[in-house]
Amino acid sequence: FERTRSLQDPCSNCPAGTFCDNNRNQICSPCPPNSFSSAGGQRTCDICRQCKGVFRTRKECSSTSNAECDCTPGFHCLGAGCSMCEQDCKQGQELTKKGCKDCCFGTFNDQKRGICRPWTNCSLDGKSVLVNGTKERDVVCGPSPADLSPGASSVTPPAPAREPGHSPQ
């Protein structure tokens, strides 16, 4: 019975971008301006999201798909679907309640967002510091001090050549 009823339901014939208008004998009517339906058989169209202020339109709303927002230059999105915008900082900084502040010694941030993270402690892996860390970059760990004893080579062999047109996975 349910299956029969759904087959006879005139609304199931209404495509995306339309809605089944109960006020007009269940005729498929186009979605009104600033609304959309992304699937067929809808009894109403959804209101489009509006991107204003700190948000800017990344994708315009159409009759079949919602608008998508991102943040204006100098900001980055937070939350799924960009529900909030947070100020960018420079690499080597983090955003605090007092604004963008340089990373403390021993920490780094290689992005315009997020927090400063501690440099890697090479000695925990039995390695030595090959390249010192900065505010913007983590330290680079090299071979352990024992590996650098006289006679031991500290030069790593070259990576095998890749065929042209193949990128690393």
Partner: antibody, heavy 115, light 107 residues
């Protein structure tokens, strides 16, 4: 530190114009906009309107005929003007920075409309 | 305009109990709902944005869920400082709107 502070007369006569300012610090007025929101005593929150970083404005249709929001970047201030006030406009008025979700609010200022 | 309806209007619970607050939207608002806490004489304070993201510095006992038209704020174990009024707000479409609030009081 991000700070917003509303100020203005606490008492306004009916039919006159309510004028409030929102003085901000800790962020640039050319980077962020500001929203004005009000709360009548013992009631919920009502969005009045906003001014964006570029200077354009959006208003709640319920206020559009009598509201003006503006910015004075030299003074680090946003302003709200609401004309032809009645007792129904008695409320705490807040400004809040535009970041998409109202993370930073002023402490609010109570405006009473009475003769 | 999008209407947000919060329930219950008042919730009476004891410290340590779990609080569940509801917010229903008259239209689909995706996940663009925020939750605010307001104490007497203070401005609202952002707790949750994007329906489920805890704002900076908000304790882990606060969590949000939902999408579309039905949203929930849960406080897993009530602390004495949690008794306040809670508002949901939508940032999906203009005019921006708020629920009428849920008062969380000590039983």
């Amino acid at each position: 530190q991000v700070q917003l502070q509303e100020s203005g007369p606490g008492l306004v006569k009916p039919s006159e114009t309510l004028s409030l300012t929102c003085t901000v610090s800790g962020f640039s007025l050319t980077t962020y906009g500001v929203h004005w929101i009000r709360q009548p005593p013992g009631k919920g929150l009502e969005w009045i309107g906003a001014i964006w970083s570029g200077g354009s404005t959006d208003y709640n249709a319920a206020f559009i005929s009598r509201v003006t929001i503006s910015v004075d970047t030299s003074k680090n201030q946003f302003s709200l003007k609401l004309s032809s006030v009645t007792a129904a406009d008695t409320a705490v008025y807040y400004c809040a920075r535009d970041d998409g979700s109202f993370a930073n609010w002023g402490q609010g200022t109570l405006v009473t409309v009475s003769s | 305009e999008i209407v947000l309806t919060q329930s219950p209007a008042t919730l009476s619970l004891s410290p340590g109990e779990r609080a569940t607050l509801s917010c229903k939207a008259s239209e689909n608002v995706g996940t663009y709902v925020s939750w605010y806490q307001q104490k007497p004489g203070q401005a609202p304070r952002l707790l949750i944005y994007g329906a489920s993201n805890r704002y900076t510095g908000i304790p882990a006992r606060f969590s949000g869920s939902g999408s579309g038209t039905d949203f929930t704020l849960t406080i897993s174990s009530l602390e004495p400082e949690d008794f306040a009024v809670y508002y949901c707000g939508q940032t999906y479409s203009y005019p921006l709107t708020f629920g009428q609030g849920t008062r969380l009081e000590i039983k």
